[in-house]
């Protein structure tokens, strides 16, 4: 807290300019009018204030707007945004995507801070849903943003927003998140033709069920091993050797290198060895010839 002192003669700020960098904290407090600061916030970002000085400017704005800053001020906060606490931000009503972009720009290159997380939360809640433009903006600044949301939060993403998602945006998503996103992506891309559809849906396939993988195997998609390894184990297990061969196309040879890893390992254990042998890859661990395979889960379902 800066002590309350009278502004020295001749030092009253008539505008926000670089001469203020020479002011002490108490002088900024005494000589800069909060209303002037609010109307000239766009200048603050161009002036090399110290963090100590920014503290004073923030304090002045806090006094002027105890219920929270208006968006006209928020949009021009610049580096002053870094001084805001999540509690400060919860008082704001940010509706403009331009304001959001301006503040995200300040934090660019850094991990998502609690301030940024709160800002995004306030913005998205204010909009009611995560629309395409917002998602586009957020993933541009934070490629991992989508995967930071809970499955419940992801459920509010409209299918139309899926068009904004890039493959790298899904890199850190877990199966539960992909379970929510995959049906949305399937719906979003449903009118695309086979090869184009596969290119778009590929990143979301970690949430695909068995029947969709079977359907894809009939379309000569040539899925790469990296995508295959991200598929749900329970979705891969029912696939036949022939279906996996069609699904992977020329990439099927990569199964050998992955035979000890899930889901390939678990899938191999479910296949007949003589079916695996038809691949000519030397995959071992399948069910020996002459053995009967009982699907206990099917038996339980029937009883």
């Amino acid at each position: 807290e800066v002590e309350k002192t009278a502004c020295p003669s001749g030092k009253k700020a008539r505008e926000i300019d670089e001469s203020l960098i020479f002011y002490k904290k108490w002088e900024l407090e005494a000589c800069v009018d909060a209303a002037l600061l609010a109307t000239q916030m766009d200048r603050v970002n161009a002036i090399p204030f110290t963090y100590e000085q920014l503290d004073v400017l923030k304090h002045k704005l806090d006094e002027l707007y105890p219920q929270g800053y208006p968006e006209s001020v928020i949009q021009h906060l610049g580096y002053l945004f870094l001084k805001m606490s999540p509690e400060d931000i919860r008082k704001w009503n940010v509706t403009s995507l331009e304001t959001l972009k301006a503040l995200l720009e300040v934090n660019k290159g850094h991990e998502m801070s609690p301030q940024v997380a709160t800002l995004i939360d306030r913005f998205v809640k204010g909009r009611g849903q995560l629309d395409k433009d917002t998602l586009d903006t957020l993933t541009a600044f934070y490629p991992g943003y989508l995967c930071s949301l809970s499955p419940e939060e992801l459920s509010s993403v409209p299918p139309s927003s899926i068009w904004a998602v890039r493959p790298q945006d899904l890199d850190t998503c877990d199966p539960r998140q992909l379970d929510v996103l995959y049906p949305k992506a399937r719906l979003a891309f449903q009118n695309m033709n086979g090869s184009e559809y596969f290119v778009k849906i590929q990143s979301f396939l970690g949430g695909a069920p068995t029947e969709d993988l079977k359907a894809l195997s009939q379309q000569n998609v040539s899925m790469d091993l990296a995508t295959f390894m991200k598929l749900r184990t329970d979705a891969v297990l029912p696939l036949t050797v022939a279906e996996v061969q069609k699904l992977l196309g020329p990439h099927v040879e990569g199964l050998k290198a992955e035979e000890r890893h899930r889901p390939v390992r678990d899938w191999i254990l479910r296949q007949r060895q003589d079916d695996l042998d038809t691949l000519g890859l030397g995959l071992q661990g399948g069910i020996p010839n002459g053995y009967l395979v009982l699907d206990l889960s099917m038996q339980e379902a029937l009883s």
Epitope: E3, P8, K11, E18, S19, I21, F22, K24, K25, W26, E27, P48, T50, E52
Partner: antibody, heavy 121, light 107 residues
Framework: QVQLQESGPGLVKPSETLSLTCTVS??????????WGWIRQPPGKCLEWIGN???????NYNPSLKSRVTISVDTSKNQFSLKLSSVTAADTAVYYC?????????????WGQGTMVTVSS | EIVMTQSPSSLSASVGDRVTITCRAS??????LAWYQQKPGKVPKLLIY???TLQSGVPSRFSGSGSGTDFTLTISSLQPEDFATYYC?????????FGCGTKVEIK
Amino acid sequence: QVQLQESGPGLVKPSETLSLTCTVSGGSISSSSYFWGWIRQPPGKCLEWIGNIYYSGSSNYNPSLKSRVTISVDTSKNQFSLKLSSVTAADTAVYYCARLPRGDRDAFDIWGQGTMVTVSS
Amino acid sequence: EIVMTQSPSSLSASVGDRVTITCRASQGISNYLAWYQQKPGKVPKLLIYAASTLQSGVPSRFSGSGSGTDFTLTISSLQPEDFATYYCQQSYSTPFTFGCGTKVEIK
């Protein structure tokens, strides 16, 4: 290790302009963490602050000298300069350049060796 | 402008003595005060800033105290290399102003 070195004529005629340059070595004058200043000390008298400058060119002067003083910066040469116009014998002094860390309770932490300037015809 | 008045203007002391120099500001300056040491023909050297913070590399026998208008520089045990002139300076508001110095001489 940052060092400052003043340079300029040691003798200036009355009514002329005193010009001094301070060269910063061992560090960049363009650091956002410092102001750069000029201070003078007339023989046997008190130290007097002349003014400060930031690498952007923004400056701040002693009101008693403001009408006659100009401090400028040349970041490409890592130098800042002092010009004092219409000099009189009262401007005879040792002139120091110094570094001032930017902070609320700042103080001149590095000084040049000082250069004696005599105003005489 | 803020006028800084130092006292005494000079003093004589012996090695090992405790020496106290005072500086008074013409108005309150909180703790915006620095102390410098200057030896004959040499450059002023920063000892203390913010009234009591010791500058890096300065011996701990030097200490500063005070706030508002009255400040003190203390040398707990005077050493031969401490014989010099000491200046105070306020940085509360521009123009920055200096005291006219206290000369510490050998008794």
